[in-house]
């Protein structure tokens, strides 16, 4: 007959799960902030830099109050997957100038990957509908010049910083509502 069934698996406290996700997001925000500052020190940015392939920022001012957990997690996961892809591209195709940002870029990539896994786990623990697998994204074209790679790095780190700041705000507020 086999061993007797174990005790029913207790579902983890969603607040605790969300809490550890917030902390991981804040930790990644700190890393991104530090790396963006390092990039600015080495290659000062003249104004804002944009990259068309980056996700648009997930929210406008005043929209925080209307946030719902499934929407935040789904959107955050999609945006972070895009940033992960861009960081991988930057490390591969960014040119020799950006080699000076290693090993920090590698660490950032690993921590971004860890946060994505944590979000996936949180979504399954909260029994949220899993998003369909992402369609294969078109490959990112290599930067046209060394300076193009640096401009792309400014855009990627700046965008990631704002996305994570937005995520921390949203997750902190949602945690108080749980």
């Amino acid at each position: 007959p086999g061993p007797p069934p174990g005790p029913p698996r207790v579902s983890p406290d969603p607040r605790a799960e969300l809490d550890s996700t917030v902390l991981l997001t804040r930790s990644l925000l700190a890393d991104t902030r530090q790396l963006a500052a390092q990039l600015r020190d080495k290659f000062p940015a003249d104004g804002d830099h944009n990259l068309d392939s980056l996700p648009t920022l997930a929210m406008s001012a005043g929209a925080l109050g209307a946030l719902q957990l499934p929407g935040v997690l789904t959107r955050l996961r999609a945006d972070l997957l895009s940033y992960l892809r861009h960081v991988q591209w930057l490390r591969r195709a960014g040119g020799s100038s950006l080699k000076t940002l290693e090993p920090e870029l590698g660490t950032l990539q690993a921590r971004l990957d860890r946060l994505l896994r944590r979000l996936q786990l949180l979504m399954s623990r909260l029994a949220l509908p899993q998003p369909p697998p992402d369609p294969p994204a078109p490959p990112l074209a290599p930067p046209s010049s060394a300076w193009g790679g640096i401009r792309a790095a400014h855009a990627i780190l700046g965008g990631l910083h704002l996305t994570l700041d937005w995520a921390v705000r949203g997750l902190l507020l949602l945690k108080t509502r749980l």
């Epitope: 809490d19 804040r26 925080l64 937005w166 705000r169």
Partner: antibody
Framework: EVQLVQSGAEVKKPGASVKISCKAS????????MDWVKQAPGQRLEWIGD????????IYNQKFTGRATLTVDKSASTAYMELSSLRSEDTAVYYC????????????WGQGTTVTVSS | DIVLTQSPASLALSPGERATLSCRAS??????????IHWYQQKPGQAPRLLIY???NLESGVPARFSGSGSGTDFTLTISSLEEEDFATYYC?????????FGQGTKLEIK
């Protein structure tokens, strides 16, 4: 020199509103969030809220939600806090302070704005 | 909300003495490699000034006689040898969660 300069003292009647400004200089305004802190006489410091200059999206201490409104004017590197439906307990010094959400400490403070609520 | 309790409420010491100020949190404020406690100094009529961030990191421009330690729920600010300008009120602040809160302060007075 990194500086936050706040608007001057205000005297208001109960039920009125007050709007305090905080002008930032000496750093890139969009690189840090702006937080607001209340210090009432004989009370501990109390965090009111935080705003990101690029995306707006303020978050508030629940105690102040609905009465405090944080805004920014990026072009003027200035943050604002408006407090409505004033009552005597709102008599305090209000500070703006530079912060960020990763570690959330306040490394640069304004000089403070005294708000007195009295009939 | 996390409540921070500072002790003692006031402390009278002489210049040259060592000061030890305590801050206790109602729940742990340490996690993911960080202790989310920060210390400030405030003098009458002035804004608070950051001294120590993340429990033990000395803010730029702050004299090395200031140091911070602790983890979990118990934290300490130490001033190794008091100078005249150190007599002020000291506050701890946590940033572990929303909302960040402050302790009630420890007033350091000249004996």
């Amino acid at each position: 020199e990194v500086q936050l300069v706040q608007s001057g003292a205000e005297v208001k009647k109960p039920g009125a509103s007050v709007k305090i400004s905080c002008k930032a200089s000496g750093y890139i305004f969009r690189d840090y969030n702006m937080d607001w802190v209340k210090q009432a006489p004989g009370q501990r410091l109390e965090w009111i809220g935080d705003i990101n200059p690029t995306i707006g999206a303020p978050i508030y201490n629940q105690k102040f939600t609905g009465r405090a409104t944080l805004t920014v004017d990026k072009s003027a590197s200035t943050a604002y806090m408006e407090l409505s439906s004033l009552r005597s307990e709102d008599t305090a010094v209000y500070y703006c302070a530079r912060g960020e959400l990763a570690h959330w400490y306040f490394d640069v403070w304004g000089q403070g704005t005294t708000v007195t609520v009295s009939s | 909300d996390i409540v921070l309790t500072q002790s003692p409420a006031s402390l009278a010491l002489s210049p040259g003495e060592r000061a030890t100020l305590s801050c206790r949190a109602s729940k742990s404020v340490s996690t993911e490699g960080y202790s989310y406690i920060h210390w400030y100094q405030q003098k009458p009529g002035q804004a608070p000034r950051l001294l120590i961030y993340l429990a033990s990191n000395l803010e730029s421009g702050v004299p090395a006689r200031f140091s911070g330690s602790g983890s979990g729920t118990d934290f300490t600010l130490t001033i190794s040898s008091l100078e005249e300008e150190d007599f002020a009120t000291y506050y701890c602040q946590h940033s572990r969660d929303l909302p960040p809160t402050f302790g009630q302060g420890t007033k350091l007075e000249i004996k």
